[in-house]
């Protein structure tokens, strides 16, 4: 049974980049408003984001607890100025989104190259280690934490005079590279999870970083 | 609770296949790494291999690739580990593991171990 | 491949005294993103499988006791056990969990004096 001029949300969609996890759905609401629940497949549904006339609800509280669960969430309708009654037996529309399991599923966020060291014919290049919203006795971990040995990247490097592109990769956060004497090099990395087998298995690539600004230095 | 039960103790011949099972319980069987460890007759472990059941993504020691094969089955929660053609070095105690909630947090539940004996 | 010595191969202990076991590896096992030094140290007590004592080298385990601990960075650790007891008996490993492949040390015997 239904509500009263009320109609079931659809297109629920998941959202989620380096753990930070939003569920989205349609439609624009005319004169309703929208509560979103959340569960993982043995556990109890949790209701956020109350009577919301937006089309998302920020997740990432609940997700970060476990982002090695499988979650599924559902929208529910009510009519506009709907206010919660013990004597209501009626149940609102709703729908289900697709399962979620973080772990595998969230995006990897666009890297950004730390910093590089120039010293002779070699070139330290080091990612930065991106913070997330996952905890551990409340201390927030990085996305290295997380994935580990599960997370590694790409180093795309080229002089700064041709478009020839080169790659190394590595499994921690830093390359070691020969450049040629004499010759300025730009970097762009990018991250990846080579265990998956989806769209989401790397990153954006990061701003390209050049040797000769501000980030880098120069030793003989 | 989490539980990781091995499949029973096998007896074989050599040039014989053979396909032991680890099956996983009280937990996301998708999102964890399922490894696989030999232990020879009084000896110490060696970590054969991983795979992740969520993508069938598998990590293989080179001292093993070719002669084992690691696969996992996500719909019953199992992962098995196949030899083709059993040799009498492979005589052994084979553990599955999983691998812990962080990354890199080492192999936090065990199986209880398969014993194999491959005599002719 | 990253190469895991242990030492020594035998430890015989009294009970109520520490003990200690180095390990070290041929290779920095440093992450450089997150500064965790990745590094486990289990126990196989006789007859059975292995259990997890410590990870991130000093990270102990969910219901390991507080007289293990483990110490060191880059390619030298310990785990350090300060007042042996009966049950500590069996065979002490430590593994790189860094790099792939995984490997283990060839293993430390405690045994009761």
């Known amino acids: 049974s239904g509500t009263t001029n009320t109609v079931a949300a659809y297109n629920l969609t998941w959202k989620s980049t380096n753990f930070k996890t939003i569920l989205e759905w349609e439609p624009k609401p005319i004169n309703q408003v929208y509560t979103v629940q959340i569960s993982t497949k043995s556990g109890d549904w949790k209701s956020k984001c109350f009577y919301t006339a937006d089309t998302e609800c920020d997740l990432t509280d609940e997700i970060v607890k476990d982002v090695k669960q499988t979650y599924l969430a559902r929208v529910f309708s009510y009519p506009a100025g709907h206010v919660e009654s013990t004597g209501s037996t009626e149940e609102p529309p709703y729908e289900n989104s697709p399962e979620f399991t973080p772990y595998l599923e969230t995006n990897l966020g666009q890297p950004t190259i730390q910093s590089f060291e120039q010293v002779g014919t070699k070139v330290n290049v080091t990612v930065q280690d991106e913070w997330t919203l996952v905890r551990r006795n409340d201390t927030f971990l990085s996305l290295r934490d997380v994935f580990g040995k599960d997370l590694i990247y790409t180093l795309y490097y080229w002089k700064s005079s041709s478009s020839g592109k080169k790659t190394a990769k590595t499994n921690t956060n830093e390359f070691l590279i020969d450049v040629d004497k004499g010759e300025n090099y730009c970097f762009s990395v990018q991250a990846v999870i080579p265990s998956r087998r989806t769209a989401n298995r790397k990153s954006t690539d990061s701003p390209v970083e050049c040797m000769g600004h501000e980030k880098g230095e120069s030793r003989e | 609770e989490v539980q990781l039960v091995q499949s029973g103790a096998e007896v074989k011949k050599p040039g014989e296949s053979l396909r032991i099972s680890c099956k996983g319980s009280g937990y996301t069987f998708i999102t964890y790494w399922i490894e696989w460890v030999r232990q020879m007759p009084g000896k110490g472990l060696e970590w054969m291999g991983d795979?992740?059941?969520?993508?069938?993504?598998?990590n293989y020691n080179e001292n093993f690739k070719g002669h084992v094969t690691i696969s996992a089955d996500k719909s019953i929660s199992t992962a098995y580990l196949q030899w083709s053609s059993l040799k009498a070095s492979d005589t052994a105690m084979y553990y599955c593991a999983r691998s812990g909630y962080y990354g890199n947090s080492g192999f936090a539940y065990w199986g209880q171990g398969t014993l194999v004996t491959v005599s002719s | 491949d990253i190469v895991m010595t242990q030492t020594p191969l035998s430890l015989p202990v009294t009970p109520g005294e520490p003990a200690s076991i180095s390990c070290k590896s041929s290779?920095?096992?440093?992450?450089?993103?997150?500064?965790?030094?990745?590094l486990t140290w289990y126990l196989q007590k006789p007859g059975q499988s292995p259990q997890l004592l410590i990870y991130w080298a000093s990270t102990r385990e969910s219901g390991v006791p507080d007289r293990f601990s483990g110490s060191g960075s880059g390619t030298d650790f310990t785990l350090k056990i300060s007042r042996v007891e009966a049950e500590d008996v069996g065979v002490y490993y430590c593994?790189?969990?860094?790099?792939?492949?995984?490997?283990f040390g060839q293993g430390t015997k405690l045994e009761i004096k």
């Open positions: 290779q920095s096992l440093l992450s450089s993103g997150n500064q965790k030094n990745y």
């Open positions: 795979i992740l059941p969520g993508s069938g993504s598998t």
């Open positions: 593994q790189n969990d860094y790099t792939y492949p995984l490997t």
